[in-house]
């Protein structure tokens, strides 16, 4: 007799989970001689423990305690990029100025970029067919609670100046729902973080305009500002030529506006 | 933040001025402080720039050769020497200094402005 499983709203585990975590944990240790020390064995056996024969919606950070102490990595404090609605642009530039980093850069972001993950309770199988949805099923689910984890200790590492690359063509350039707004925002630690750096990204080509103005802008300067860390904001007029600009700054082409 | 240019004045064509820019105000290193130029009817121009960061020099294709930036041991005043000047390097020449990590020529980069400095040179 077949078994009823629960049916979700969002896609199921992502197919070959296991062996693209494994996988993944393997090729980022051997291009990081700072992480070869790591064992990707455990790293995947907490990875799963951490929701295996778990209800879904039933999952909390402790869950994943022991695959962020096996995870722990030391990136330059000063050096770290925040991003919402814009990953493709971000780790674009990430790969120009290596020596800046998001967290999709580190190893925990790196196993799980694009990956949807779930299991059952009181099985050990993962679920292939379907995973809670955010939004119509329950917030307390493996992924988010994984991305809240990490993006929590990510934001609370951080120093000095704090870059952020928001998305300039959405309704909402700052969303306060969204995990730079609601999770990264708020445990930025003012006694480490002297400044909020806002990079807005025009999409159209001949949009001139000073989006740093914006009444979502302006209330993440309040938010900010309230938390006694400084805001500043820059246009970034054109995507393309800042990313071709900051591989070669000393271009005739990267001397006016960008 | 302040930032105060100066050394500006009317030169031959062939001939050399240099520029001085005294930055003050920052707590650490974490800056880049950079020459621009705007020329009549012209947009800014990013010339060069110095990242305090790594001590790094930076100078645009446009000027490489002609323009040298520099910079004293106490790290307060930046210097831009112009050489081989020629009528259209006639402009206000500014200092800017911004707390970005990234490296940048362009001047919608730099948030802090001195005010220029006149440079014309005769033909």
């Known amino acids: 007799v077949p078994r009823w499983r629960q049916q979700w709203s969002g896609p199921g585990t992502t197919k070959r989970f296991p062996e693209t975590v494994l996988a993944r944990c393997v090729k980022y240790t051997e291009i990081h001689p700072e992480m070869r020390h790591v064992d990707c064995q455990s790293v995947w056996d907490a990875f799963k423990g951490a929701f295996i024969s778990k209800h879904p919606c039933n999952i909390t950070e402790e869950d994943y305690q022991p695959l962020m102490k096996l995870g722990t990595q030391t990136v330059p404090c000063n050096k770290i990029l925040l991003w919402s609605r814009i990953k493709d642009l971000a780790h674009q530039f990430t790969q120009v100025q290596r020596d800046m980093f998001t967290l999709e850069d580190t190893l925990l972001g790196y196993l799980a970029d694009d990956l949807t993950w779930c299991g059952e309770f009181n099985t050990s199988k993962i679920n292939y067919q379907s995973c809670p949805d955010w939004r119509k099923d329950c917030s307390n689910n493996p992924v988010s609670v994984f991305w809240k984890t990490v993006s929590r200790r990510f934001a609370e590492a951080a120093c000095d100046v704090v870059h952020v690359m928001l998305n300039g063509s959405r309704s909402k350039i700052f969303d306060k729902n969204s995990t730079f707004g609601s999770v990264e925002v708020h445990n930025l630690q003012p006694e480490k973080v002297q400044t909020l750096e806002a990079w807005v990204i025009h999409g159209g080509r001949e949009d001139s305009r000073d989006l740093c103005q914006d009444p979502t802008i302006k209330e993440l300067e309040s938010i900010i500002s309230k938390r006694n860390i400084q805001f500043s904001c820059k246009n970034i007029y054109r995507p393309d030529k800042f990313l071709q600009c900051v591989k070669n700054p000393e271009d005739s082409s990267c001397t006016s506006e960008i | 933040v302040q930032l105060q240019a100066s050394g500006g004045g009317l030169v031959q064509a062939g001939g050399s001025l240099r520029l001085s820019c005294t930055v003050s105000?920052?707590?650490?290193?974490?800056?880049?402080v950079g020459w621009f130029r705007q020329a009549p009817g012209l947009k800014r121009e990013g010339l060069s720039c110095?990242?305090?960061?790594?001590?790094?020099?930076y100078h645009s294709n446009s000027v490489k050769g002609r323009f040298t930036m520099s910079s004293d041991d106490n790290k307060n005043t930046v210097y831009l020497q112009l050489d081989s000047l020629k009528p259209d390097d006639t402009a206000v020449y500014y200092c800017?200094?911004?707390?970005?990590?990234?490296?940048?020529?362009?001047?919608?980069?730099?948030?802090?402005w001195g005010q220029g400095t006149q440079v014309t040179v005769s033909s």
């Open positions: 105000g920052f707590t650490s290193d974490d800056y880049t």
């Open positions: 110095l990242s305090r960061r790594d001590g790094r020099f």
């Open positions: 800017a200094a911004t707390t970005s990590v990234v490296v940048l020529l362009a001047p919608n980069w730099y948030e802090y």
